[in-house]
């Protein structure tokens, strides 16, 4: 468990001609806020996959009004870091998406209007516990400068925050240079020594004597910048860990605390210290507030700051769900008539009509197939005074109105049931099986056949 931290340094027009003066105007003051989305080791192109490592929303920045004639300054930014807690191991390689949002403070009906100004994405290698890495990204005419790091939450330590360090002996009992993180009270552990000369800012090691480089640095001692691009890492505030322990068997092994909670042993069992927004014996109960940034895709969070008050996400066009986490497939309502192709542009729907049809929804017939249009992108083919439809993939029937069954290929294994849900096929597994496609048997004692069930596995109840 640990926290990914993002510090935004500046956001403003990039260098070169055609740069925008300001996102705000004298007529329409505005303020900025940021959202970060983290994914483990994916390519940044997978924009629709969920923020599996977590997401966070910044506070609103100070109100800014453009002064006519004045040079464009760096825009005022929100205070503080964006913090994304992660509950499991830090993956080392991760993808990020940073969105810059503008909140206009005019007299709009229904409150402030907000719009996405810029979106940058990247894939990086980062060791937990390392120094701040600095980055510059451009999105269109805008430039974003930021730093980021990942740090472990005690008692987790290491470059992946997977090892537990429990200080059980007084520091005075260990000799010079030794740390009290060993499993027995009378044992002390020597700190990990990297290769001599390994850059403390740009290198790290997981084994004694090695020197592995952070993103943007190379060379045997990680002192050579790969290029003068965006990955330079000057010295910044560093998160020093205090030693590591390969844990022996104990009640905290495997960290029973969910949602980033940290585990400490008690004489009889264990105790979880939960991060803000979670509570319960194992931190399994969520009491999320707006302070936790629960609204995705630029959703605006409304609600009290105290843990007992509910929050509501007001979603931007094109998104829905209690956390704005689901993209609305407005085209699934098939608004385009006569086989028109539906395009969801986010702010509006657009129909691209087949030859022979016109109108905002392709409702006007212009040709001989009039009144006999094929639905869902099918093509009308005339012949011998009759017509037939050549249907698009996924549709069938005389007029292409029948949706082809996504379950026809029987994707749910071991007798599981497949359902044609609008969000895609869904499997309900027969008792004794689990997995998105019911591919994993469940042991009779209730444990899965996997070492740990990946997210999204849905167990059938083996006791039935």
């Amino acid at each position: 468990a640990g926290v990914f931290e993002l510090q935004i340094h500046s956001f403003g027009p990039g260098p070169g001609p055609g740069a925008p003066r300001s996102p705000c105007s004298a007529r329409l003051p505005c303020r900025l806020f940021f959202r970060v989305c983290l994914k483990p080791g994916l390519s940044e192109e997978a924009a629709e996959s969920p923020c599996a490592l977590g997401a966070a929303l910044s506070a609103r920045g100070p109100v800014y009004t453009e002064q006519p004639g004045a040079p464009a300054p760096d825009l005022p930014l929100p205070d503080g870091l964006l913090q994304v807690p992660f509950r499991d191991a830090w993956p080392g390689t991760f993808s990020f998406i940073i969105e810059t949002w503008r909140e206009e403070l005019g007299d709009q009906i229904g409150g402030p209007a907000w719009s996405l100004l810029a979106r940058v994405a990247g894939r990086r290698r980062l060791a937990a516990g390392g120094p701040w890495a600095r980055d510059i990204q451009r999105a269109g005419a805008w430039e974003l400068r930021f730093s980021y790091r990942a740090r472990c939450e005690p008692p987790a330590v290491g470059t992946a925050c997977t090892r537990l360090c429990r200080p059980r002996s007084a520091p005075s009992r260990c000799g010079p240079g030794l740390r009290p993180c060993a499993p027995l009270e009378d044992e002390c552990e020597a700190p990990l020594v990297c290769r001599a000369g390994c850059s403390p800012e740009h290198g790290f090691c997981e084994q004694p004597g090695e020197c592995r480089c952070l993103e943007g640095w190379t060379g045997p001692l990680c002192t050579v910048p790969v290029s003068t691009s965006s990955c330079l890492s000057p010295r910044g505030p560093s998160s020093a860990t205090t030693g590591c322990l390969v844990p022996g068997p104990g009640p905290c092994d495997g960290n029973p605390c969910a949602n980033g909670g940290s585990c400490s042993e008690t004489p009889r069992s264990f105790e979880c210290t939960c991060p803000r927004g979670f509570y319960g014996l194992r931190c399994e109960v969520s009491g999320v507030t707006c302070a936790d940034g629960p609204c995705f895709n630029g959703g605006l969070c409304v609600g009290g700051a105290d843990p007992d008050s509910a929050y509501i996400c007001h979603c931007p066009p094109g998104f829905q769900g209690s956390n704005c986490e689901k993209r609305v497939d407005r085209c699934s309502l098939q608004p385009c008539r006569n086989g028109g192709l539906c395009l969801d542009l986010g702010h509006a729907l657009r129909c691209r009509c087949r030859a022979g049809f016109a109108g905002p929804r392709c409702e006007h017939d212009l040709d001989d197939c009039a009144g006999r249009a094929c639905a869902n992108g099918g093509t009308c083919v005339e012949g011998g005074g009759a017509h037939r439809c050549s249907c698009a993939l996924g549709f069938g029937g005389r007029d292409c109105r029948e949706r082809a069954d996504p379950c026809a290929a029987r994707p749910c294994a071991h007798g599981g049931r497949c359902y044609a849900h609008f969000s895609g096929l869904v499997c309900a597994c027969a008792p004794g099986y689990m997995g998105a496609r019911c591919e994993f048997p469940v042991h009779p004692d209730g444990a899965s056949a996997l070492p740990a069930a990946p997210p999204g596995l849905r167990p059938g109840d083996p006791q039935r």
Epitope: R417, Y419, V426, C429, D461
Partner: antibody, heavy 118, light 109 residues
């Protein structure tokens, strides 16, 4: 527009039998759904009776409904519920409903009233 | 499988918050295959929330579902007059079994 319509309800005597029909429009059972029957006695909450899975025709029943109620697929757009040995306690509005994933009923018919009385 | 809803009835002022609880005697399938419905007299139930927390298309965002396993909650923030109705939870269980809760009547004043 996807719709379900129930028919076949009415007055029946105790120990009598009745068959209800659910007719789908705007979609057919060529896709895989649970087509289910749910009843609601006056002033009470809904009560699940049975489902037929259109993917393979398998059926599931509430424990209390086994033996007296039979669900079957009559065509690609109709499902029936045969009810036997009806009692006064079976008086209710009978709904046809569709589960198309995640175990919830996203589409309901308006219901048909079954009255068991002598 | 028995679903118990509390409290009933529940009363709220316009703009207030309503919280309804639903407890299952056993864990629902996948720990989150639980849905919430709103029903008004003479109408079939209408789904509000599916899979414990997902808002059905067209349902106002003031409805929020939460919970997992055996304990679930429906919260209505900023209640409107139109929200006066009876609310039911419904679970889906391993072995393809469905069950409904007993219902909670919500009065908005």
């Amino acid at each position: 527009q996807e719709q379900l319509v129930e028919s076949g309800g009415g007055l029946v005597q105790p120990e009598g039998s009745l068959t209800l029909t659910c007719t789908a429009s705007g979609f057919s059972f060529s896709s895989s759904y649970d087509m289910c029957w749910v009843r609601q006695a006056p002033g009470k909450g809904p009560e699940w009776i049975a489902c037929i899975y259109t993917g393979d025709g398998s059926t599931d029943y509430a424990s209390w409904a086994k033996g007296r109620f039979t669900v079957s697929k009559a065509s690609s757009t109709t499902v029936t519920l045969q009810m036997t040995s009806l009692a006064v306690a079976d008086t209710a509005t009978y709904f046809c409903a569709r589960n198309s994933g995640y175990g919830y009923f996203g589409l309901w018919g308006p219901g048909t009233l079954v009255t068991v009385s002598s | 499988q028995v679903l118990t809803q509390t409290p009933s009835p529940v009363s709220a002022a316009v703009g207030g918050t309503v919280t309804i609880s639903c407890q299952s005697t056993e864990s629902v399938y996948g720990s989150d295959w639980l849905s919430w419905y709103q029903q008004k007299p003479g109408q079939p139930p209408k789904v509000l929330i599916y899979q414990a927390s997902n808002l059905e298309i067209g349902v106002p965002s003031r409805f929020k579902g939460s919970g997992s396993g055996t304990q679930f909650t429906l919260t209505i923030s900023g209640a409107q007059c139109d929200d006066a109705a009876t609310y039911y939870c419904q679970g889906y269980y391993s072995g393809y079994i469905y069950a409904f809760g007993g219902g909670t009547e919500v009065v908005v004043k």
